[in-house]
Every structure is written in structure tokens, then in C-alpha cells.
Amino acid sequence: APVRSLNCTLRDSQQKSLVMSGPYELKALHLQGQDMEQQVVFSMSFVQGEESNDKIPVALGLKEKNLYLSCVLKDDKPTLQLESVDPKNYPKKKMEKRFVFNKIEINNKLEFESAQFPNWYISTSQAENMPVFLGGTKGGQDITDFTMQFVSS
């Protein structure tokens, strides 16, 4: 069976949108009006992994691009990157663990925990125009809560 995917955008809890910053980086900033068209559209695929009522495993690809968010060790630190893949083979139901995020639903907000590195989350800074990164703390200065907006295909 083919993997199921949905197109969506994400905004952090301060309503910052995610946009491309160079070929392999995302940044978060406030957008308004026509600038909203700059925001990244994700193809969220529902993949194999540990699932519970609050937690659903997903992969986050960039729509119509062969790029996926992935989590790898760089200089011994869990790091978020955009990784290029062969579009003939992706997305797939059994994604490699580095591509898998646990989409956790709490009080109408979403967190995206790395399956590869538990307790590390897709994060944004309070500051404007800063890179989206993998953070190891919740409830601190950095933002780990998001909302999801579905986008028609």
C-alpha cells in the first residue's frame, strides 16, 4: 500500500511561518499578506513507527522537492538538516529513523519529536529570521509548539 501523505504548512506558537533560507535550511519569521506565499509547504507522510493516542509517526518532506527533514549527529550533537533523497524511492512507509518525527498532540498544539533522538524537538527561536533547529529542551526560551494548516493538493 502506498504511504499516505497530506500537504500542510506549520507555524510556531508565536505564529511565525517557516520559509527556505538557502538550499538546505529553514528559518522562522512572521509573514503577512502576499508574503505568506513564501512559506514552505510540507508533504507530511504517515509512516511506520511507535504510535499512541497522542503520538503519530510522520516524515516531513518539502512538497514537490526531494528534500526531507532529518536528524543526524553533527559534532556529537543531534542536528536538524534538510536531506536530499532519490524521489523514485521516497516517500515510503518504512522511512529510515532519521526521517521520522513523532507528531505529538497536546492541547491543540503539535510537537515534533525526533524518533532517532528522543526528547529532541523541532524548534524555533524567539528571535525573528533564525534557523529552525533541533532542540533538547521543552518549555524554555525556544519554541517547540506548532500548529498545522492543511493545504489542498
Epitope: 499516505r4 497530506l6 504510535e51 507528531k103
Partner: nanobody, 123 residues
Framework: EVQLLESGGGLVQPGGSLRLSCAAS????????MGWVRQAPGKGLEWVSS????????YYADSVKGRFTISRDDSKNTLYLQMNSLRAEDTAVYYC????????????????WGQGTLVTVSS
């Protein structure tokens, strides 16, 4: 043509048990995640349970966890739901769903569903 035919519903007393079946045809059953959703009188659809294509992963709504068991027999193209310790609030039409994928706590995607079987829990 995909067909899903549920059976096994009926009237049962609180605390009783029922086993629902769903006979599937028209697609390669073993390749697909399957599941059950239900609709209580006057309410919306509620996800009940899912089982992975291999049958090695099962998922349950909190409201039925520990009471219901989902299973599948790929040799018979059949999905099952064993319902124990039934309660009045389990009264609903139960639908079998093909390629059921849960996308959030209260949202699902599925390709096909059957006509349903009515379960009534009452004394």
C-alpha cells in the same frame, strides 16, 4: 471493486461480549492497514482501533483500550473486533475501514468503508 461487509452486531447486555467481522474483497487485503470506526446515535464518527498491514501493530482509542481487541486473518481476508465488557456508551454502528490512517487524535483518512453493523448495549 472494493467491498467490505461487516457482521456480528446485535443486542447485548452491559458487561457482555460481541465479535465483529469484516469480510474484504476487491483489493490485496494483506497490504493495507485496516481499522474500525463507529458512529453513536446523533454523534460523529469516532476512531476505535487500527491494525497494521503485517498485523504486528495494533492501536486503540482510550475509550476501548483493555476491552477491545483488533485482529486480522489475511488468509481469509477478514478483519475482526473482539469487544468485551461492553458498556451502554459503546452503542453505535461499527464500520470497517480500508487503508485507515490516523492523522490526529480526531482525524483519519481512509479509502473505503463498509455499510456497518449495529451494536446495541442495553439491559
Amino acid at each position: 471493486e472494493v467491498q467490505l461487509l461487516e457482521s456480528g452486531g446485535g443486542l447485548v447486555q452491559p458487561g457482555g461480549s460481541l465479535r465483529l467481522s469484516c469480510a474484504a474483497s476487491g483489493f490485496t487485503f494483506e497490504d493495507y492497514q485496516m481499522g474500525w470506526v463507529r458512529q453513536a446515535p446523533g454523534k460523529g464518527l469516532e476512531w476505535v482501533s487500527s491494525i497494521s498491514a503485517m498485523g504486528n501493530r495494533t492501536y486503540y482509542a482510550d475509550s476501548v483500550k483493555g476491552r477491545f481487541t483488533i485482529s486480522r486473518d489475511d488468509s481469509k481476508n477478514t478483519l475482526y473486533l473482539q469487544m468485551n465488557s461492553l458498556r451502554a456508551e459503546d452503542t453505535a454502528v461499527y464500520y470497517c475501514a480500508e487503508n485507515l490512517v490516523r492523522i490526529s487524535k480526531k482525524q483519519w483518512m481512509f479509502d473505503y468503508w463498509g455499510q456497518g453493523t449495529l451494536v446495541t448495549v442495553s439491559s
